[in-house]
Interface confidence: low
């Protein structure tokens, strides 16, 4: 769920998601369209695709709450939950570490980017 994602991103990146990533660029936060603006935005576009795939499998991506552990800088998704919960955790883990990998190219100007100006082809999943 969204609470899981927020907590995980904060733990991995050290940034408050509400202040730094939701929204950011053309794909971070709810919805997304157009060409991603940078590597951080690509992380979110890929994450959107991950969620879209789970939706087609009938997973309730915003309501499903999964269990995980964060220790020594790594995320360990619990194998005790449902398939949907485990996959959701995997999607969120991937985006959290993707955002961390790209902290050095994070652009403050893309925070609250003007979505109507997100142009170009939206990448396929």
């Amino acid at each position: 769920g969204i609470l899981n994602l927020n907590k995980m991103v904060k733990q991995v990146t050290g940034k408050m998601p509400i202040l730094s990533y939701w929204p950011y660029g053309c794909h971070c936060g709810l919805g997304g369209r157009g060409q991603p603006k940078d590597a951080t935005d690509w992380c979110c576009q890929t994450h959107d695709c991950c969620y879209d795939h789970l939706k087609t499998q009938g997973c309730s991506i915003y309501k499903d709450y999964y269990r995980y552990n964060f220790s020594q800088g790594n995320i360990h998704c619990s194998d005790k939950g449902s398939w949907c919960e485990q996959q959701l955790c995997a999607c969120d883990k991937e985006v959290a570490f993707c955002l961390k990998r790209n902290l050095d190219t994070y652009q403050k100007r893309l925070r609250f980017y003007w979505r109507p100006h997100c142009r170009g082809q939206t990448p396929g999943c």
Epitope: G31, K108, R109, R111, F112, W114, R115, P116
Partner: antibody, heavy 113, light 107 residues
Framework: QVQLKESGPGLVQPSQTLSLTCTVS????????MQWVRQPPGKGLEWMGA???????QYNSILKSRLSISRDTSKSQVFLKMNSLQTEDTAIYFC???????WGQGVMVTVSS | DIQMTQSPASLSASLGETVTIECLAS??????LAWYQQKPGKSPQLLIY???SLQDGVPSRFSGSESGTQYSLEINSLQSEDAVTYFC?????????FGSGTKLEIK
């Protein structure tokens, strides 16, 4: 093309409730956030609140206790309700598409007995 | 709340001149600033977004820049139709706030 139009009463009695409608065309409310802004005669602009594309609502804390924003996506309409009106609420009320790339023409609301 | 201090409140310039309007944010707004033009009896029109990006259809004589928390709108080759009111606005966080406005007049 994109169009926004506000409608509502031009005159409201003090202590009464103001109800305004913003009717949009050329885009879907489920894809764009919508804002309400007001401007007292000869003065500056004040942001009142917004309803996000996902349905979440945010209010200016100064007005929060008196304000209600809602929408009907099937009718492409956004609504503003504000109660306990006083003469200082006299203003032109605008709806605008987030982030203010399109505005309605505004509706003048006078609070007077 | 983030305060936007706009200056000057009014200014007068001659046709063809360059004028600058400034807005000072009370804290870092990370380029999340827009400029609007408002003609009498009309709704505001977006000129500049993200501090320096020109909105579609806006003449290139309008430009925006920033330095720290100070944001500027520059109008080059002033024309008679530019003699209206200009507002800045941050969209960093809620509540969004506007500057108090600058009324531009032609000498």
């Amino acid at each position: 093309q994109v169009q926004l139009k506000e409608s509502g009463p031009g005159l409201v009695q003090p202590s009464q409730t103001l109800s305004l409608t913003c009717t949009v065309s050329g885009f879907a409310l489920t894809s764009y956030d919508m804002q309400w802004v007001r401007q007292p005669p000869g003065k500056g602009l004040e942001w009142m609140g917004a309803i996000w594309a996902n349905g979440n609502i945010q209010y200016n804390s100064i007005l929060k206790s008196r304000l209600s924003i809602s929408r009907d996506t099937s009718k492409s309409q956004v609504f503003l309700k504000m109660n306990s009106l006083q003469t200082e609420d006299t203003a032109i009320y605008f709806c605008a598409r987030f982030r203010f790339d399109y505005w309605g023409q505004g509706v003048m609301v006078t609070v007077s007995s | 709340d983030i305060q936007m201090t706009q200056s000057p409140a009014s200014l007068s310039a001659s046709l063809g001149e360059t004028v600058t309007i400034e807005c000072l944010a009370s804290e870092d707004i990370y380029s999340n600033l827009a400029w609007y033009q408002q003609k009498p009896g009309k709704s505001p029109q977006l000129l500049i977004y993200d501090a320096s990006s020109l909105q579609d259809g806006v003449p290139s004589r309008f430009s925006g820049s920033e330095s720290g928390t100070q944001y500027s709108l520059e109008i080059n080759s002033l024309q008679s139709e530019d003699a209206v009111t200009y507002f800045c606005q941050h969209h960093r966080d809620s509540p969004l706030t506007f500057g108090s406005g600058t009324k531009l007049e032609i000498k």
